[in-house]
Structures are given as C-alpha cells and as structure tokens.
C-alpha cells in the first residue's frame, strides 16, 4: 500500500483531526474517575481499574487490549503492627511517637485502604540510637560530614530531608556511612512555597503530610527477584538475601510536625553553613544526639513492613499499523498510585485515555497509522518501575528489533508555568516543530505558539531563541526502553517556575492530599495545561507513527556529543598532572565525535534526496534512524550496573532522577583524588574513554552508506 492509502487522508489533515478530537473536558472526567479511591499496586482496586481501562480502550476502538500479569516483589506496612518512630527516655519509655497516618483530606474521611506513609522495601527492625542530621543525604553532604566535620554516622540513626535527589540514593549513602536507620522528612523549605496555603486551602504540604516512596537501588533491574527476566509463572526467583537493590537498614518517612519534635532537641555540631538549614524553627544542629537536658534520650524506630510476591497487571493496547505493522511506537504511563494519585499518575493516565480515545475515533472513521502504536498502562511503577520493566524483559527481542520510540506519560503536571521536555537528541527537532504548531495555554501568550511561551519562560542555556530540553535520567517507566534497550524516548509535562519555586517536585507529591480537588481547584481548573500536554504527547506519537520518514535528526546527536565530550574533558583536566603521568588522552573520543558529525551530516543530505517512493530504500533509511539509538548500547552495560547499557546517557550514580552524560567516564573520574590506587583508577578512566570512543565511532558507522 502507498502511504496515502494507508493513512486515508493527507498526514497534515490527520494530525489536525487527531489534535482537534482531544478535549479538556474529557481529560477532567477521566481524572475524576481514576482518583476516587486508592489504586495501590497489587491491590484488588488496581486490578479492577486495569480491567476498566482494558474495557474502555476496546470501546474506543483499539484492535486488541490485553492484560499482562507478573508476580513481583512488593512491600506493604503491617496492618496490625504500625510503623512509627519514638523518642525514648533513659528508662526506655516512649515519650513521643510520630504519627501513624496522615489526617485525611476533606471528603475522604471514610475511604478505606489508604496505605499509611511508609518507605517501601524497608527491612523490619527496631534500631535505637543517637540522631545525626545529614541535610539531603547527598554524596556531598556525607563528604562534608565525614571529611570536613569528622562526624561518624556509624551506628547512628540519620535524619535526612527529602529533595534534590532520589530517596533511594539517600538511603544507599546512609548505609555506606554505617547508619543503622534512616528517617526521611519533608522540610517546609523544600515543600512549602511562600505565600501559598496548605491543603485543603492551597497546594502546599501541611505539617501532617508525608511523602511515600520506594527506597530501592535497582539500577534498572526491575523485579528484585528476577533481574533480567520476566517474573512469569515459571520464573526462578532469587532468595531475599540475593534480591537486587533492597535496603539493609530500616527507613521511615515523616512530616514536618513530627520532624520538628525530633530536630528541636538536636545538639552536637552546628550546621556547617546556611545550605544545611531548612525553614523549621530548630537549630539544624548536626548532632550526634540531643542537647544537654535531653542527652539521655534516644530515638527508636519501629518498622514492621513486609515484602511479598504479589500479582501486578499491565494493560497493553494495540493499534495496528497499515504499512509497517512491525514497527512499534509506544505510549506508556503508569496506573498504580500511592493513594489517590491526583497528579501522580492519574493526571498522566487521563491524558493517555483521551489520546487513545482520539486515535480510536480516527480509526473508526477508516484511518490507520502507518506504524503500529502500542498503548500501555503500567502497574507497580511506584515500587521500582516493575510493570514496564517486566513487560520489556518479556518482549525484549521484539522491542529491540521493532521499537521505533517510547513516549512516557506519567504526571501531566508538576506546576502550571511552562512546558518541560526531556528526550533523546533525536527528538529535538520533532519537539520544536510540533510545539511551533500548537497554541500556548499560558496567560499573556494568547494567539502565540507553545514554542514561543516555552522558549520565553525556559530558554536553552546554550542556544538563544530555543527552549531548554533536558537529558533523560530515570525514576520513570521510560528507563528500560531507553537505558537498557536503546529505544529513542521522550517525556513532556507542564512544570513550575524553577527560578521562583525552589522546592523539590511539587509539595503534595506522594501524599494523601494528591487528590482530584488539588488539580481541579489549584493547578488546572480549566484543564488547559492537561490538554496541551495531551497535544504534545499525542502529537509526538502521531508523527512518530505516521511520518513517512522518521522525524529523527541525527545531526542533533552530533551537537550534544561534542558538548558532552567537552564537558567530560574539562572535568578530567582538573587533574592535569595525573593525566600526564598516566597518559590519559581524549583524542580518540574527540576523533569519534568528529567522525560522527561528518557522517551524520552526509546521512542528513542523503535523507533529503533519496527516492521516498521506493519502499526498500525508505525502509533502509528509516531503519538506520531507528537503530541509531540502539547503536549507543553496550551489551556489557556500565560497571556494576548491567542494566544501564546506554553509553551516552545513564541515571546519575548519585541521583537516579538526573541524567549523566558519558556516565562511564564520569563515574571513573568521580572523587578520583581520594582513590587508594591512583594508577588503577586512572586506568579505568582510560578504559572508559576507550569504550565511549569506540561506541560513538560504531554508532557513526551505522549511518554510513550501507555499501
């Protein structure tokens, strides 16, 4: 079939028809429907929602909609033995206890099955000891404590504020410092924006609000008991002692009212500088232990959560492609929530639902996409990206041969200021061109394009007149597709003004107060930002699935590779003497980047000129574009992180949420001055430069003329 037969009408007309069918009112209705009760992974309520979505996607017109189930390790509090933290006196009496649950929001007082705040996958334990305040528990915070202040965390319970980095990294750092327990809390400095009221009167975190979340260090493994393989009916499971990424010390989260009671008594060292002070009326003393009158008092944790193998359900919908059914464009987002999921994930799931409905409407009118579109409602994302990872493990052979792109669809909003996009460089031009065609929803930008408002509010730090697009990190369901399989990936959502709001994430993240009303009253009453995000995500999927030539520009990869090479070289050049001593050279990497740039340029010229009516040549050129991201995958993976295989990007070893460029070289150089064997350390730097240079050169060659 010709592409026009396949798509029934001209591509431009189809895109307009698709976008025009997306309605804010529908997204609002779907969000309400998805947020009336909790949908915790592994529960009956979430299974019922999976079946509802399956049924509705079928009604919307998808060709097939199936449930894919897996039996994975999850974690739950003990219903009859609650988790809490105490201050105990010298006789062991509990003189203060932290809260057992959050005060429910208005209208939700009689809702059952609200899971109390807990740190998922914490081991059981009742450690007691002196407290040490460790700021955000980042790598640099422990460096400050141990190296500069000479404070030893060994055998101590540490208290860290949420924010800046993924909570799992905080716990890992505390473990490495020898702590025997971790208390995580939300400081108003990070979760209470000035001039805004607490929920239910505004979008700020009340003192009794607590952030839930997993504390794993999976490094892309998926289910901790079946790394690399799907957790299916015949799976061989590791013993719990061999499970991937589980924390070894008890961990528990609290709100700032409880934190106040723990921190107000802290003695020992004063905070090293103002960056260690939050907004509570406490001294932010580091400790260890309590001050004078309270020095005999200790902190005791009571953690009784259990890890259980539990069934989870993904919903997988298929809209078969008319011309290239064996090429897959995937739109996926998770369905499971910690409680009501008003923002995370249901603001994203509602958008996916409306995108499916719009595609289904076009299909019922006789249209089909050129390529197959797969829609996914992932389960157990909150427990470590488990649903998406298990499905990708089960389907890895198909995905690595047929996967064109993955677009993620978690929370549609984390603010209402401007667009935020993280994606592969291959998608930069797609995102730019699409946002130039969409209307901005922002006040003061009526009649202007989304590109214009986005560029004005979030300018690129490198290129004037262009918007900021960030590197992909992790902490969401694109991880397995991008970091493990090398499928071009992207994500988009509306965000806050990072200049004026320096709190981490949004204040009510993972709390009981993340409700439908939070979104409808305070973030997006008209659902216009949700609609814009639907247009961006849906528009990207439409173009990726329907463009005759894939909308990837390999020249943009060349530009960033040069930037990343410059950056890592400048980091290395902080050690000029060692580079000389150990003959460390980046020549091979810069040469490979130069070759990539030249070959990408020539490929782009051929892409303009080739005969698009020749289906074999068209397919050949598209395959070179599709497989370019795959070419950056090293089958051996990164050191000690076998499931992070992308040589150009990986989640930071110090913050899972952040992306790091040339991560192998970066990690080899990190804190190299403290390594006991400098010769070995610099040898590893050289090896990583070699791997990176080889990979860039090999990727470049995939773009060369085939013969």
């Amino acid at each position: 079939k010709s592409s026009n037969e396949a798509t029934n009408i001209t591509p431009k007309h189809n895109m307009k028809a698709f976008l025009d069918e997306l309605k804010a009112e529908n997204i609002k209705k779907f969000l309400y429907n998805f947020t009336q009760i909790p949908h915790l992974a592994g529960t009956e309520q979430n299974f019922q929602l999976a079946k509802q979505i399956q049924s509705q996607w079928k009604e919307f017109g998808l060709d097939s909609v199936e449930l894919a189930h897996y039996d994975v390790l999850l974690s739950y509090p003990n219903k009859t033995h609650p988790n809490y933290i105490s201050i105990i006196n010298e006789d062991g009496n509990e003189i203060f206890n932290t809260s057992l649950f959050e005060p429910p929001p208005p209208g939700y007082e009689n809702v059952s099955d609200i899971v109390p705040p807990f740190s998922a996958f914490s081991p059981q334990g009742m450690p007691e000891g002196d407290l040490v305040y460790v700021n955000y528990a980042r790598t640099e915070d422990f460096f400050k404590l141990e190296r500069d202040m000479k404070i030893n965390c060994s055998g101590k319970i540490v208290i860290a504020r949420y924010g800046k980095v993924f909570r799992g990294n905080k716990v890992k750092n505390a473990q490495l410092a020898g702590a025997k327990g971790v208390i995580l809390y939300s400081d108003p400095a990070d979760y209470f924006a000035p001039g805004v009221k607490s929920y239910p009167d505004g979008w700020n975190l009340p003192g009794g609000g607590v952030q839930r979340g997993n504390i794993l260090n999976l490094n892309g493994a998926g289910d901790p008991l079946t790394p690399g393989y799907p957790a299916n009916e015949y799976a061989y499971r590791r013993g719990i002692a061999e499970a991937v990424g589980l924390p070894s010390i008890p961990v528990h989260p609290i709100g700032y009212y409880d934190a106040q009671k723990l921190l107000e008594k802290m003695g020992g060292s004063a905070p090293p500088d103002s960056s260690w002070r939050g907004s509570l009326k406490v001294p932010y003393n580091v400790g260890p232990g309590f001050t004078g009158n309270f020095s005999t008092q200790k902190v005791k944790m009571h953690i009784h959560s259990t890890n259980e193998v539990t069934r989870i359900y993904n919903v997988i919908g298929t809209l078969r492609g008319a011309v290239e059914p064996d090429r897959y464009v995937i739109l996926g987002g998770h369905r499971d929530s910690w409680v009501f999921g008003g923002i995370d994930p249901q603001s994203g799931a509602a958008v996916v639902h409306e995108i499916v409905r719009s595609f289904g409407t076009l299909k019922k009118e006789g249209w089909r996409p050129r390529r197959t579109i797969l829609f996914a409602s992932w389960d157990a994302e909150e427990f470590g990206l488990l649903g998406s990872t298990e499905w990708a493990e089960e389907n890895s052979r198909l995905l690595q041969e047929r996967g064109v792109a993955y677009i993620n669809a978690d929370s549609s909003i984390e603010g209402n200021y401007t667009l935020r996009v993280d994606c592969t460089p291959l998608m930069y031009s797609l995102v730019h061109n699409l946002t130039k065609e969409l209307k901005s929803p922002d006040e003061g930008f009526e009649g202007k394009s989304l590109y214009e408002s986005w560029t004005k509010k979030s300018p690129s730090p490198e290129f004037s007149g262009m918007p900021r697009i960030s590197k992909l990190g992790s902490g969401n369901d694109f991880e397995v597709f991008f970091q493990r399989l090398g499928i071009a990936s992207g994500r988009a959502r509306y965000t806050k003004n990072w200049e004026t709001n320096k709190f981490s994430g949004y204040p009510l993240y993972h709390s009981v107060y993340e409700t439908y009303e939070l979104v409808e009253k305070f973030y997006d009453p008209m659902f216009k930002y949700h609609l814009t995000v639907a247009q961006v995500r849906g528009g990207m999927v439409f173009e990726l699935a329907n463009s005759i030539v894939l909308p990837f520009d390999c020249r943009d990869y060349a530009v960033v590779l040069r930037k990343y090479a410059d950056k890592i070289y400048s980091i290395s050049m902080k050690h000029p003497q060692e580079m000389k001593t150990y003959s460390v050279s980046f020549d091979s990497l810069f040469s490979a980047v130069k070759n990539f740039t030249e070959i990408a340029s020539k490929f782009s010229e051929r892409l303009q000129d080739f005969d698009k009516s020749n289906p074999i040549v068209l397919r050949m050129m598209n395959d070179q574009l599709m497989f370019l991201e795959r070419a950056f995958i090293d089958p051996l993976g990164l050191p000690d992180r076998p499931f992070y295989r992308h040589v150009i990007y990986a989640p930071s070893s110090h913050n899972k949420y952040a992306g790091e460029s040339f991560p192998g070289i970066y990690d080899a150089l990190f804190d190299i001055e403290s390594k006991v064997d400098p010769s070995k350390a610099w040898g590893e730097v050289k090896r990583q430069i070699y791997v990176a240079a080889f990979t860039v050169q090999a990727a470049a060659e995939t773009l060369s003329e085939v013969a």
């Epitope: 809490y84 809260s99 057992l100 005060p103 429910p104 003192g207 009794g208 009212y257």
Partner: nanobody, 123 residues
C-alpha cells in the same frame, strides 16, 4: 454545624470510675487532636488530657496521670475520657475541645468547645 456534645457526667463516690463521651458533628474527628479540660466550682480552667488525631500520643496533667485515660473512636466520631480512682478534687465541669491545628502532634490552642458535663465526686 460544627459542635461537640459531652455526656456521661454524674455523681459518683470516691474511688469509683466514670466514662465521659464527646460526640463530634460537623467536622471529622479523625483529622484533629482533642482535649479534655475541666473547671472546678469557683476555679479557673484546668487542662486535663490531649490525644493526637491518630492516637499516637496522649498527654495528661500531672493531677490525673495514671488514673485517667483519653481515647477516641474515629469511626464513631467520638472522644472518651475514662476516669478511674476518682477523688473529690476531680469534681468539675468537663469540657471536650478541638485542637486548632489539623494533624497537630502536641497540645496547642483550642478552637471549638462543648457545653460541658458535670462530674461530682462525693461520698
């Protein structure tokens, strides 16, 4: 509208027990710390006990510690005060009061009061 209604008071002999109830309406008890306060004849107000919204912490005045127990049933929207080993000096009007801070962890100020129930301890 928002109100608290105490009940269970009466005349009781020293050494005996009594259980006071406080039914809340117009707001969810589950979100608020709650107090018992008393006023002996011709005296000022005296704070008796406080319980956090979730039941994790209970605080008592020294005069009643070990004898009185504050409790709550959030599903019934009701607060209780179990008074054992009653003494003549426990004679007072007992009021329940709502703490003004949602989710508060320690006793703060009161914002809503009941009309009180009289307890008389006399032989």
């Amino acid at each position: 509208q928002v109100q608290l209604v105490e009940s269970g008071g009466g005349v009781v002999q020293p050494g005996r027990s009594l259980r006071l109830s406080c039914a809340a309406s117009g707001f969810p008890l589950i979100s608020y710390g709650m107090h018992w306060v008393r006023q002996a004849p011709g005296k000022g107000l005296e704070w008796v006990a406080f319980m956090t919204y979730d039941g994790s912490n209970r605080y008592y005045a020294d005069a009643v510690k070990g004898r009185f127990t504050i409790s709550r049933d959030n599903s019934k929207n009701t607060l209780y005060l179990q008074m054992n080993s009653l003494r003549a000096e426990d004679t007072a009007v007992y009021y329940c009061a709502r703490d003004r801070i949602v989710g508060g962890r320690v006793p703060d100020a009161f914002d809503i009061w009941g009309q009180g129930t009289m307890v008389t301890v006399s032989s």
